[in-house]
């Protein structure tokens, strides 16, 4: 059976967008009016891992596009790539574990855990305009809550 | 053509047992994460239970956590659910559903699902 997936954008709980940065990076930043069409469409699929009532395995993929978040260790530390992967043989129901994210859900808001680093988030700053990332600390200065806004396919 | 067909509903007192079944045809059964949902008399379509392909994994609301038990024998392309402990809350019908993936807390979404089999606790 092919996975599942639905498209949909995520914003932070400041309301910031999503939007590519150069071809393997994505930034966070306020849009309003036509420029919210440069916001990043995702791919979520529904995949295997530890699901409870709360979380939900998901791997995040670009729409129409070869590119999936990861999770890797760049220099010890677990570090938020975009990984270029096969058309061919993805998005796929067993994903290898740096691409899962736990998705959770609490009151109302997601966070994304990194299945490959527990306790790491994609992460963005308070900061206009800076990269999105993978942060070991909630409920700091860096923001983990995000909505998910659903996209007709 | 899928088909999906429930049985196994009744009347029971609380705290009784009930195992409900679905025969499955018109695809590759073990292919399919399976699950079951319900519906309460005047209320919307609640998520029950799902099984994996392979019936390795098995995730419950935390309604029925502890008191149902999903599973599967692909060889009879069949589904079940073992319901025990019964509650009046538990009251509704209950329909099968194919390629059952939960993508919200209480949404989840489905490609086929049966005409349902209608459980009634009650003294």
């Known amino acids: 059976a092919p996975v599942r997936s639905l498209n949909c954008t995520l914003r932070d709980s400041q309301q910031k967008s999503l939007v590519m940065s150069g071809p393997y990076e994505l930034k966070a930043l306020h849009l309003q009016g036509q420029d919210m069409e440069q916001q990043v469409v995702f791919s979520m699929s529904f995949v295997q891992g530890e699901e409870s009532n709360d979380k939900i395995p998901v791997a995040l993929g670009l729409k129409e596009k070869n590119l999936y978040l990861s999770c890797v260790l760049k220099d010890d530390k677990p570090t938020l790539q975009l990984e270029s992967v096969d058309p061919k043989n993805y998005p796929k129901k067993k994903m290898e574990k740096r691409f899962v994210f736990n998705k959770i859900e609490i009151n109302n808001k997601l966070e994304f855990e990194s299945a490959q680093f527990p306790n790491w988030y994609i992460s963005t700053s308070q900061a206009e305009n800076m990269p999105v990332f993978l942060g070991g600390t909630k409920g700091g200065q860096d923001i983990t809550d995000f909505t998910m806004q659903f996209v007709s396919s | 053509e899928v088909q999906l067909l429930e049985s196994g509903g009744g009347l029971v007192q609380p705290g009784g047992s009930l195992r409900l079944s679905c025969a499955a045809s018109g695809f590759t059964f073990e292919d399919y994460q399976m699950g079951w949902v319900r519906q309460a008399p005047g209320k919307g379509l609640e998520w029950v239970s799902s099984i994996s392909a392979m019936g390795n994994r098995t995730y419950y609301a935390d309604s029925v956590k502890g008191r149902f038990t999903i599973s599967r024998d692909d060889s009879k392309n069949t589904l079940y659910l073992q319901m025990n402990s019964l509650r009046a809350e538990d009251t509704a019908v209950y329909y099968c559903?194919?390629?059952?993936?939960?993508?919200?807390?209480?949404?989840?979404?489905?490609?086929?699902w049966g005409q349902g089999t209608l459980v009634t606790v009650s003294s």
């Open positions: 559903a194919q390629n059952l993936v939960r993508y919200m807390k209480s949404q989840w979404m489905f490609d086929y």
